[in-house]
């Protein structure tokens, strides 16, 4: 039976949401973002073994072909399934503005 | 200047659409799909160097953090940006049906 959320490689090894603490300098934003000065970046990291959090039919195909032709076809990859918005205070040509970014922080993850 | 479509690793090395010829047996579909017997599977394969086909702000962040912490944060990954639908003739409990799958064949690719 398929169990799309149990990691066969051991706890925490498979595709999941991780938080990485980063400064504006780390992100390359220091010259245009005023705030926040530090960001808890949520991103998708981990392995995508067979049937683990498969996003769609394409991911199933990719895994099957990867097993057949590992040198040609890579395994599915852990990427965001959805995002959390974030608001930044940034410098603009006209001054300072608040800007919402919808695709900045991963909310949950799957394998594609 | 940013050039999101020029591969710095050489032609064909970066994230792009590839076609892989596969049989139903290769795909693990032989027991439930009647036709087609063979599929030209389009999928996204290749490296995601800095600024190449970045899908969104998250991809930019991921690349910047990957450069800082390569052991912790993986590089962005080449995945479908959109899909082409495909119709399969398949066996069902009641006989045979035509079924459209919207997420089976990659149409174009980007780095996330």
């Amino acid at each position: 039976a398929r169990n799309g959320d149990r990691c066969p490689l051991g706890p925490g090894r498979c595709c999941r949401l991780h938080t990485v603490h980063a400064s504006l300098e780390d992100l390359g934003w220091a010259d245009w973002v005023l705030s926040p000065r530090e960001v808890q970046v949520t991103m998708c990291i981990g392995a995508c073994p067979s049937q683990f959090r498969e996003a769609n039919m394409h991911a199933q195909i990719k895994m099957n072909l990867h097993r057949l032709k590992p040198d040609t076809v890579p395994a599915p990859c852990c990427v965001p399934a959805s995002y959390n918005p974030m608001v930044l205070i940034q410098k603009t040509d006209t001054g300072v503005s608040l800007q919402t970014y919808d695709d900045l922080l991963a909310k949950d993850c799957h394998c594609v | 200047a940013r050039n999101g479509d020029r591969c710095p690793l050489g032609p064909g090395r970066c994230c792009r659409l590839h076609t892989v010829h596969a049989s139903l047996e290769d795909l693990g579909w032989a027991d439930w799909v009647l036709s087609p017997r063979e599929v030209q599977v389009t999928m996204c394969i290749g490296a995601c160097p800095s600024q190449f086909r970045e899908a969104n702000m998250h991809a930019q962040i991921k690349m910047n953090l990957h450069r800082l912490k390569p052991d912790t944060v993986p590089a962005p990954c080449c995945v479908p940006a959109s899909y082409n639908p495909m119709v399969l003739i398949q066996k069902t409990d009641t006989g045979v049906s035509l079924q459209t799958y919207d997420d089976l064949l990659a149409k174009d690719c980007h780095c996330v």
Partner: antibody, heavy 120, light 107 residues
């Protein structure tokens, strides 16, 4: 704990200038920006402007443009709000409020408030 | 500027009552809405940020919901210390703007 302590009440004549201070403690001052908000007697809250405590960049409410200046002194972890050409309708309690660590456009904590009375 | 309209302007309620306050933005603000509580002679206090996230130390009887233009603050079971004025504030663009306030009074 995080605290914002403001200067004391002021009585000013119309046309004068007032400068209110806001001393921060309990966090790294230049890591989070500061807004100023005022509240006229019996009225609601009115945002006056924002200053980046890191860079000094400011944005002011349109109606106060030209009369208000916000500054900071990172050496003393203090933010200042100066309002010029005072009028009677500037009588209000003035608050400094730090941007929240969770969301930059939410305000937490707030100073205790400084009453500025403009009267001839 | 984004206008914030709060309703009702006042509500009379008893201890233990469920109280709901609404806030409407004149244009979409995603989920960038904060709620504050203010007691007489005191500074406002942040209760909810990002529409539904409870600020640390705030009792769980307070909750927020909504996105886009329509938002709600709910006090599930009113306590004596909850009688105060509540303000919403949009944080999607400068200038930051507040609703007119809702006074929660003892019935």
């Amino acid at each position: 704990q995080v605290q914002l302590v403001q200067s004391g009440a002021e009585v000013k004549k119309p046309g004068a200038t007032v400068k209110v201070s806001c001393k921060a403690s309990g966090y790294t001052f230049d890591s989070l920006g500061m807004s100023w908000v005022r509240q006229a007697p019996g009225q609601g809250l009115e945002w006056m402007g924002y200053i980046s405590t890191y860079s000094g960049d400011t944005v002011y409410a349109q109606k106060l443009q030209g009369r208000v200046t916000m500054t900071t002194d990172t050496s003393t972890s203090t933010a200042y709000m100066e309002l010029r050409s005072l009028r009677s309708d500037d009588t209000a309690v003035y608050y400094c409020a730090r941007e929240s660590g969770q969301q930059v456009s939410a305000l937490d904590p707030w100073g205790q408030g400084t009453l500025v009375t403009v009267s001839s | 500027d984004i206008q914030m309209t709060q309703s009702p302007s006042s509500v009379s309620a008893s201890v233990g009552d469920r109280v709901t306050i609404t806030c409407r933005a004149s244009q979409g603000i995603s989920r960038w809405l904060a709620w504050y509580q203010q007691k007489p002679g005191k500074a406002p206090k942040l209760l909810i940020y990002a529409a539904s996230s409870l600020q640390s130390g705030v009792p769980s009887r307070f909750s927020g919901s909504g996105s886009g233009t329509d938002f709600t603050l709910t006090i599930s079971s009113l306590q004596p210390e909850d009688f105060a004025t509540y303000y919403c504030q949009q944080g999607a663009s400068f200038p930051l703007t507040f609703g007119g306030g809702t006074k929660v009074e003892i019935k």
